[in-house]
């Protein structure tokens, strides 16, 4: 059974992940239309279901494509280089989802834009945090 300290740690990690994702979304939304238009040409894949921490596997698998889009915007609106930002997110995701069980991510048929993708994972973080508090 999860202890209060492990729950608190999970909550803090989720809050950290949430802040990183929100920072990326804010950075993207700051772009003038021409750049945003280019970023929106990238297709992202969404999980069929995202209700548990193990479903973060689906986020982990899309981090490299996310880094590619952020490379388009590398110097403008982010404090960190895309590689470092994604590396930080990857560390949190790996800790949160755990490595004990191998979960095969199932993806929805429809693709999403970067904005929809980030919003989906922001909602996921908020939802899990609310169950922990």
């Amino acid at each position: 059974a999860p202890t209060s300290s492990s729950t608190k740690k999970t909550q803090l990690q989720l809050e950290h992940l949430l802040l990183d994702l929100q920072m990326i979304l804010n950075g993207i939304n700051n772009y003038k239309n021409p750049k945003l238009t280019r970023m929106l040409t990238f297709k992202f894949y969404m999980p069929k279901k995202a209700t548990e921490l193990k479903h973060l596997q689906c986020l982990e698998e899309e981090l490299k494509p996310l880094e590619e889009v952020l490379n388009l915007a590398q110097s403008k609106n982010f404090h960190l280089r895309p590689r470092d930002l994604i590396s930080n997110i990857n560390v949190i995701v790996l800790e949160l989802k755990g490595s004990e069980t191998t979960f095969m991510c199932e993806y929805a048929d429809e693709t999403a834009t970067i904005v929809e993708f980030l919003n989906r994972w922001i909602t996921f973080c908020q939802s899990i945090i609310s169950t922990l508090t």
């Epitope: 021409p34 280019r38 297709k43 894949y45 388009l72 915007a73 110097s75 403008k76």
Partner: antibody, heavy 121, light 113 residues
């Protein structure tokens, strides 16, 4: 049709700089990134970096960071690659390239004819 | 950076015979969401720029003869020329286009035996 036409061959002294141009036609230069790839004589291909002509955003390979400058002039549909502090190992053919119509960044589908830069004292 | 290892360095094949070139990446190039491998193959003849043959490991570029085919997934990939023609003499390179910086293999020289 898409065409990338590069400037002519250059001979440079060690320590100097070279600026190679790449004129795009057959599409709007602001719609795609322009990449630069080099190839030393008898050697393989090495990606140097890209520029987004839309806003001048650049992304350089770590190896060339600080020595290469990519720029673009949208009014003439021309991209430029400037390499400074030249040394003999920089002797190579320099290519500009563009991605496929259907892919935002890679792979490189359209290439310039190449510009030979020779660095010799 | 992702390291691309190509083999063999050179290959001599008789006209009309099959030529096979291998490429191995240091990390998986498979994107789970779309099941695509971000690997391309190029042909380069002397004095010419590289020519895109195949991308996403197995998608032929428009106008490329169908004797050229690509296969493989994850970290192991193959370019096959089913029936070698004289005009296929060239150096062939693989390229990973999954993550920046894109990286090329060292090349495989294909000659007529």
């Amino acid at each position: 049709q898409v065409q990338l036409v590069q400037s002519g061959a250059e001979v440079k002294k060690p320590g100097s700089s070279v600026k190679v141009s790449c004129k795009a036609s057959g599409y709007s230069i602001t719609d795609y990134l322009i990449h630069w790839v080099r190839q030393a004589p008898g050697q393989g291909l090495e990606w140097m970096g890209w520029i987004d002509p839309e806003d001048g955003e650049t992304n350089y390979a770590q190896k060339f960071q600080g020595r290469v400058t990519l720029t673009a002039d949208t009014s003439t549909s021309t991209a430029y690659m400037e390499l400074s502090s030249l040394r003999s190992e920089d002797t190579a053919v320099y290519y500009c390239a563009r991605s496929l119509d259907s892919t935002p960044i890679y792979p490189f589908a359209y290439w310039g004819q190449g510009t030979l830069v020779t660095v010799s004292s | 950076d992702i390291v691309m290892t190509q083999s063999p360095d050179s290959l001599a094949v008789s006209l009309g015979e099959r030529a096979t070139i291998n490429c191995k990446s240091s990390q998986s190039l498979l994107r789970s969401g779309n099941q695509k491998n971000y690997l391309a193959w190029y042909q380069q003849k002397p004095g010419q720029p590289p020519k895109l043959l195949i991308y996403y490991a197995s998608t032929g570029q428009s106008g490329v003869p169908d004797r050229f085919s690509g296969s493989g997934s994850g970290t192991d990939f193959t370019l096959t020329i089913s029936s070698l023609q004289a005009e296929d003499v060239a150096v062939y390179y693989c390229l990973q286009h999954y993550i920046t910086p894109p990286t090329f293999g060292a090349g495989t020289k294909v000659e007529i035996k």
